[in-house]
């Protein structure tokens, strides 16, 4: 019996087609992805093959103005239109709290939404009961297939699930659910979830009875043969893991942003064992036409987005200096504003010992593309912010050693004075540079804001300590020459859309007045500073 698994993950509100790098589509003849194009390909496969499942491994939420405006209603509507068979909850599905998941998505989806390792307690237990499930048995042709869901255990640090949801260890939670399905004679089981490729492989190895793992969160691109676009494969598709009980378990993921449709064909014997598996992600490029009816629906929903982007979010009573003459040379108040918004967006009081789990932010000055003038009645709109942050990136959470951060700050000024983008703006960090010293030895003081304290204060950076830092995904991926971040990071979790983070902060504050306040200091001659 042959099953075709079509899968997406980490779509992050790319409902419309995008450019090759998943930012805004500029030249339509070269654009990719989007739900209208995805639907064309899915329908083509459904017509050609008998047993097809369309699955999503989480993080549909968050990523473009679509989510900012429609808050998940767009996800339910278009996933229903594409007739998804099941979805796993990702960490970003909790970005607007549990209510922001229940009302727009859980109550509206015509497909099961799954997670076996999220347990509701207290008053939420009855409210959310039955709205998401640990597993769902689906009819596929004349057979049945069990789908078991899982979600990153790190979600309380990455999103806003509140205090009444407990995120258990994935493997511990999955095993009894899979055992139950086996007891119920369901002999073909897919684990569908959102914990990243390393956990996907562990699930394949450790959870007895799981036949296939369909994952997300780490934006992993797998491919067999010559890859069709810019993504470099992390391994073959499917990635085969040998389980502890000696089975070959295919593990798949399909990069992100709806650029590819994962396509996996599995052959099962009559006892539900996987005999063979093969496939590849399908690049959804312009050779695949956009479905006209879905496209028309997208255009109808688009209208509200254009109206939204010109509405006032809040006011500034100071000039927001985002000029390259400032932000690439010294502390600029636009950089301070953005970093403050980044930290504010990551306030998660999950431990009594810590006022917050993260206090530090770094931001490449070259990523700030425009100032905002206060002499326009002080008005700030989404459109204004899109000029400041035009790249459609995310503000991510990483864990780094102090020594890596020190290297990053050396890199920040290694060729100071040439208006290069790597000059870092900061939050929760005080840095002093001596630019008369040779490159690679210019950081003379680096103090960071404590987290395990009731009164936040600045302490010298410790080289061997592990710190959490919020930064643009561009930096986490080694952009602007920050190779040391990419090479040495200990953990990387994708965050919220950059513009969304700043717009939410401005709406929350109502009136802003960021100052230049001595976070970054530089001098061109020797002072008596001690090295740390």
């Amino acid at each position: 019996w042959e099953l075709t698994i079509l899968h997406t993950n980490d779509v992050h509100s790319r409902l419309e087609q995008t450019s090759e790098d998943s930012s805004k589509c500029v030249n339509a003849s070269r654009c990719m992805g989007g739900v209208a194009r995805l639907f064309t390909k899915v329908q083509q496969i459904r017509r050609a093959e008998p047993n097809v499942l369309l699955l999503d491994a989480g993080d549909q939420y968050q990523g473009t103005i679509w989510f900012t405006v429609y808050k998940g209603a767009e996800v339910a509507h278009f996933m229903n239109a594409l007739r998804y068979d099941a979805m796993a909850l990702g960490n970003h599905e909790f970005d607007n709290g549990v209510e922001g998941l229940i009302e727009p998505l859980l109550k509206e989806a015509k497909f099961p939404i799954l997670s076996a390792n999220i347990k509701a307690k207290g008053p939420l237990a009855s409210q959310i009961s039955g709205l998401y499930l640990p597993y769902k048995v689906l009819p596929v042709g004349d057979e049945v297939v069990g789908i078991v869901g899982y979600t990153s255990k790190e979600t309380p640090f990455l999103s806003n699930p509140g205090t009444n949801l407990v995120f258990e260890d994935e493997i511990t939670a999955l095993q009894p659910e899979v055992d139950k399905l086996k007891t119920l004679n369901v002999n073909k089981i897919i684990a569908l979830g959102h914990s990243g490729f390393e956990m996907d492989k562990l699930i394949a190895q450790k959870v007895r009875g799981v036949d296939v793992v369909v994952g997300g969160h780490s934006n992993t691109f797998l491919y067999t043969g010559n890859p069709p676009s810019k993504e470099v494969p992390a391994g073959k598709y499917p990635f085969i893991v040998t389980s502890d009980d000696g089975r070959k378990v295919p593990v798949v993921q399909a990069y992100a942003f709806g650029k590819y449709l994962g396509y996996l064909k599995i052959e099962f014997d009559e006892r539900g064992n996987v005999i063979s598996s093969h496939g590849n992600p399908i690049l959804l490029n312009s050779s695949i036409p956009e479905d006209p009816s879905i496209k028309a629906d997208i255009n109808k929903w688009r209208i509200k987005l254009d109206n939204y982007s010109t509405q006032e979010l809040g006011k500034t009573i100071v000039y927001l200096d985002g000029s390259s003459q400032s932000c690439r040379f010294r502390e600029c108040n636009m950089g301070n504003l953005i970093c403050d918004a980044m930290i504010n967006n990551n306030l998660r009081h999950t431990d009594e010992m810590f006022w917050n789990h993260v206090s530090m932010c770094i931001l490449n000055g070259g990523g700030i593309r425009s100032p905002i003038d206060e002499r326009n009645n002080g008005t700030i709109t989404w459109e204004n912010l899109a000029a400041v942050l035009p790249f459609g990136g995310t503000f991510d959470l990483v864990q780094l050693k102090g020594s890596t951060l020190k290297k990053a700050f050396e890199h920040s000024v290694h060729r100071y004075g040439q208006s290069t983008g790597e000059f870092l703006q900061v939050g929760g960090i005080h840095v002093v540079y001596d630019l008369s010293r040779k490159p690679g030895d210019r950081v003379v003081k680096l103090d960071v804001l404590c987290t395990k304290c009731r009164v936040p204060s600045y302490d010298p950076l410790k080289m061997d300590e592990v710190y959490k830092v919020i930064l643009p995904n561009f930096l986490a991926n080694g952009g602007d020459g920050f190779q040391m971040i990419k090479d040495e990071l200990l953990r990387h979790d994708s965050g919220d859309q950059d513009i969304n983070v700043v717009s939410t902060y401005i709406s929350k504050m109502k009136v802003i007045y960021p100052a230049v306040e001595g976070r970054i200091k530089a001098h061109h001659h020797h002072h008596h500073h001690h090295h740390h």
Epitope: P112, L133, Y135, K136, V144, L181, T183, N185
Partner: nanobody, 128 residues
Framework: QRQLVESGGGLVQPGGSLRLSCAAS????????IGWFRQAPGKEREGVSC????????YYADSVKGRFTISRDNSKNTVYLQMSSLRAEDTAVYYC?????????????????????WGQGTLVTVSS
């Protein structure tokens, strides 16, 4: 082989009663949400009544509330639908369906999601 077999259908006069049975083989019914659905000629299939395995909670479509009663006997691996005060509009093929997923009885009956196991159906005709 897993099977759901419905029985008890037939011809009955308006106002009369019938009891439908759904016998399960190859199923541990305790773990399943079971539903009765019906399809009248030229109409969509609709959920009539559903019962859970664990807490025995039930759901009834508005059109049958107070007239139909769903029950289950796990020792016999059978679910029943007692139908009384039958009307002409109750004429349909009645299907039994089962889902081992922990869906609510309401979600099962709507049905919100595809249901994996179905019987062949039994015809109920209400006519004078």
């Amino acid at each position: 082989q897993r099977q759901l077999v419905e029985s008890g259908g037939g011809l009955v006069q308006p106002g009369g009663s019938l009891r439908l049975s759904c016998a399960a083989s190859g199923f541990l019914l305790d773990y399943y949400v079971i539903g009765w659905f019906r399809q009248a000629p030229g109409k969509e299939r609709e959920g009539v009544s559903c019962i859970s395995g664990s807490d025995r909670s039930t759901y009834y479509a508005d059109s049958v509330k107070g007239r139909f009663t769903i029950s289950r006997d796990n020792s016999k691996n059978t679910v029943y639908l007692q139908m009384s005060s039958l009307r002409a509009e109750d004429t349909a093929v009645y299907y039994c369906a089962a889902d081992p997923s922990p869906v609510t009885v309401q979600a099962m009956c709507l049905p919100r999601f595809p249901v994996p196991y179905w019987g062949q159906g039994t015809l109920v005709t209400v006519s004078s």
